[in-house]
């Protein structure tokens, strides 16, 4: 089953996906697609990396982290209701049928209030307010508001830098992470 992420219309959506390269600079191709992961590749590709760099990109879809260190999380800018749906993060590990596939469900909610026309730091709702985690027995729900007072843009960094913490494990379990090698 897909893990659910939420964002409001007009905000940025953040979909986490991680892997650990076997060696520095030893990257694995990754693709992001709209729709559940098919048997091969990604359907409706919105972004793709190869062994070195981003090699395909479409408007509003950006790599949000340091993808050369394995953070291939996706940011979708200025979302609309049409952006709702399943997204596939596919870690394309060499070999037959070795790929790791992660389906992430994005739910877009109508904006509660018409946002003021500020251009500054619209990341406040980039990470879902409510996230259902897995990997700790029964599904849990955590409200990010109960976390320490941190900038939500820091979440994926925390997941990288504080791997042993419960927050980091929850984030990685609720998104997608795989160790290569």
């Amino acid at each position: 089953s897909e893990v659910e992420y939420r964002a409001e219309v007009g905000q940025n959506a953040y979909l986490p996906c991680f892997y650990t390269p076997a060696a520095p600079g030893n990257l694995v191709p990754v693709c992001w697609g709209k729709g559940a992961c098919p048997v091969f590749e990604c359907g409706n590709v919105v972004l793709r990396t190869d062994e070195r760099d981003v090699n395909y990109w479409t408007s509003r879809y950006w790599l949000n982290g340091d993808f050369r260190k394995g953070d291939v999380s996706l940011t979708i800018e200025n979302v609309t209701l049409a952006d709702s749906g399943i997204y596939c993060c596919r870690i394309q590990i060499p070999g037959i049928m070795n790929d790791e596939k992660f389906n992430l469900k994005l739910v877009i909610k109508p904006a509660k209030v018409t946002p003021a026309p500020t251009r500054q730091r619209d990341f406040t709702a980039a990470f879902p307010r409510m996230l259902t985690t897995r990997g700790h027995g029964p599904a849990e729900t955590q409200t990010l508001g109960s976390l320490p007072d941190i900038n939500l843009t820091q979440i994926s960094t925390l997941a990288n830098e504080l791997r042993d913490s419960r927050l980091a494990n929850d984030l990685r379990d609720s998104g997608a992470t795989i160790r290569i090698g």
């Epitope: 972004l47 981003v54 950006w62 940011t75 800018e77 990288n160």
Partner: antibody, heavy 122, light 108 residues
């Protein structure tokens, strides 16, 4: 060929304002995050501000937050830096720089303009 | 906040190997980028993502990054390599780009 051409620098009194422009050519402007980086005479490079490709998100160094505003006009392939409440310590060469492809923040600065000098003095 | 530490100066004889370091807490977990700046000129990217070289940059320039130190290595140094070299990272905790304060490479 990628080209970045800054303009708008000059001499301004403390407390004054200035607007820098950076005209970009040779690439799809809206596909790249852009930044302003400055360098005071004889000093280190200091990142000032960044803006995502669409202009939807902006980021500022603590030293300029609340005084400087970065913006972009993708239809004109131009990056701007509005500088208000200028101080003597803002005196520097200001460079515009292009980030890397497909990344929200830009990650690194692949191309740089030649810079424009801003002098804040009475 | 995150800090990058570079030695103020490095001296090397022509034809020898120069190593310029950039220190930071667990910097190996971040991608490091290096710039060369000659007097009166804009910086030029010489290494990105720890060890990648942009087109037009000689193979003599290489980079590595692990633990708490990133290193820019210039082999067979030439007089034209004399410049200031800056390391840079993106600090995702603050959403700030950070530069080291530069290392002046002097070719003896």
């Amino acid at each position: 060929e990628v080209q970045l051409l800054e303009s708008g620098g000059g001499l301004v009194q403390p407390g004054g304002s200035l607007r820098l422009s950076c005209a970009a050519s040779g690439f799809t402007f809206s596909s790249y995050a852009m930044s302003w980086v400055r360098q005071a005479p004889g000093k280190c490079l200091e990142w000032v501000s960044a803006i995502s490709g669409s202009g939807g998100s902006t980021y500022y160094a603590d030293s300029v937050k609340g005084r400087f505003t970065i913006s972009r006009d993708n239809s004109k392939n131009t990056l701007y830096l509005q500088m208000n409440s200028l101080r003597a310590e803002d005196t520097a060469v200001y460079y515009c720089a292009r980030g890397s492809y497909g990344t929200y923040y830009g990650n690194y600065f692949e191309y740089w303009g030649q810079g424009t000098l801003v002098t804040v003095s009475s | 906040s995150y800090v990058l530490t570079q030695p103020p100066s490095v001296s090397v004889a022509p034809g020898k190997t120069a190593r310029i370091t950039c220190g930071g807490d667990n910097i190996g977990g971040k991608s490091v980028h290096w710039y060369q700046q000659k007097p009166g000129q804009a910086p030029v990217l010489v290494i990105y993502y720890d060890s990648d070289r942009p087109s037009g940059i000689p193979e003599r320039f290489s980079g590595s990054n692990s633990g708490n130190t990133a290193t820019l290595t210039i082999s067979r140094v030439e007089a034209g390599d004399e410049a200031d070299y800056y390391c840079q990272v993106l600090d995702r905790r603050s959403d700030h780009f950070l530069f080291g304060c530069g290392t002046k490479l002097t070719v003896l």
